[in-house]
Interface confidence: low
């Protein structure tokens, strides 16, 4: 899916005002600390395109986050604020209730939820360039796509 | 621990330029915006302008473009401002600040100490 | 550019009694931060985001406010709050008020 359209400033509202506090409530009792963030993303559609994979896509040491809180949330902050997005997802939902029924938070999820929160936490300040300020420059040009 | 460490204080004449550094520590340079704001003897502070280690993006005040230049160099984790022009009335302390997303906007949660910059023939 | 007028510009008031500073903004802002100042030291954050109270700043300070004025309450002056506040603003870039002094009277 190409996040491009979303409208990246209602996203950002739907996760300041409850998707960071419900990825806060999973990570409780984890130090801040206790993670590397090794995944990062360049611009918004690229975050949202990371976010998504992390969120929603099974991995080794933690089958399924999707039917957490925030990734709940998120799923339906997408569904509304991304055009499109809701009739792609229809496949991956059924693959999703088939991964996990039952709900066991190892280190590899306390990883995952992690990275997330740096994806988040960088979809949030993109870039000066969508601060409003007709004056920006940017000497790296760091808008790198990358498509999964 | 956070901490911003600027270089020492300068003395320039009318016409010169100043470059300010700013030693970042204690987290990842590249996560968090820099500021520059100053002060000239009692007044109030002045923000100069910010830059986005991350990839360089900056962004000035106008009252100060074309004369100041922030800069990052991230293997060192270091930021600088750079001033040209020099006048008397650019007498003051310098400082750097931390800007981070938090409690829903971005402020200053962390400064360095200052550094004094004294313009006088 | 937003522009922030502090008032009053100083504050003379005794330990024990309650100072009220006001930060008004020229259009209407989100949120405003707070920093105090002591003589020879940087700022330091004291309220983020309107009401939040940075680390360490005790519960006798408060925020409030909303679209073009904001208020810095100490509800008891205690020796150690005597300095100089100033407001910020983030909404379009960043601009500071001018700063109340508190000071003893």
């Known amino acids: 899916y190409d996040f491009t359209n979303c409208d990246f400033e209602k996203i950002k509202a739907a996760y300041l005002s409850t998707i960071s506090k419900d990825l806060i409530t999973y990570m409780s009792g984890t130090k801040s600390t206790e993670f590397n963030n090794t995944v990062s993303c360049s611009n918004r559609p690229h975050c949202l395109t990371e976010i998504q994979s992390l969120t929603f896509n099974p991995t080794a040491g933690c089958a399924s986050l999707a039917k957490e809180m925030f990734a709940m949330k998120t799923k339906a902050a997408l569904a509304i604020w991304c055009p499109g997005y809701s009739e792609t997802q229809i496949n991956a939902t059924q693959a999703m209730k088939k991964a996990r029924k039952s709900k066991v938070t190892t280190n590899k999820c306390l990883e995952q939820v992690s990275q997330l929160q740096g994806l988040w936490r960088r979809f949030n300040r993109p870039l000066l360039k969508q601060q409003g300020s007709s004056d920006y420059k940017d000497d790296d040009d760091k808008h790198h796509h990358h498509h999964h | 621990e956070v901490q911003l460490v600027q270089s020492g204080a300068e003395v320039k004449k009318p016409g010169a330029s100043v470059k300010v550094s700013c030693k970042a520590s204690?987290?990842?340079?590249?996560?968090?915006?820099m500021n520059w704001v100053r002060q000239a003897p009692g007044q109030r502070l002045e923000w100069m302008g910010i830059i986005s280690p991350y990839n360089g993006g900056t962004s000035y005040n106008q009252k100060f473009k074309g004369r100041v230049t922030i800069t990052r160099d991230t293997s060192a984790s270091t930021a600088y401002m750079e001033l040209s022009s020099l006048r008397s009335e650019d007498t003051a302390v310098y400082y750097c600040a931390r800007e981070d997303y938090d409690y829903d906007g971005y402020a200053m949660d962390h400064w360095g100490q200052g550094t004094t910059v004294t313009v006088s023939s | 550019e937003i522009v922030l007028t502090q008032s009053p510009a100083t504050l003379s008031l005794s330990p024990g009694e309650r100072a009220t500073l006001s930060c008004r903004a020229s259009?209407?802002?989100?949120?405003m931060h707070w920093y105090q100042q002591k003589p020879g030291q940087a700022p330091r954050p004291w309220i983020y985001a309107t009401s939040n109270l940075a680390s360490g700043v005790p519960a006798r300070f408060s925020g409030s406010g909303s679209g073009t004025s904001y208020t810095l309450t100490i509800s008891r002056l205690e020796p150690e709050d005597f300095a100089v506040y100033y407001c910020?603003?983030?909404?379009?870039?960043?601009?500071f008020g001018g700063g109340t002094k508190v000071e003893i009277k």
């Open positions: 259009s209407s802002v989100s949120y």
């Open positions: 204690g987290y990842t340079f590249t996560d968090d915006y």
């Open positions: 910020q603003q983030w909404s379009s870039n960043r601009t």
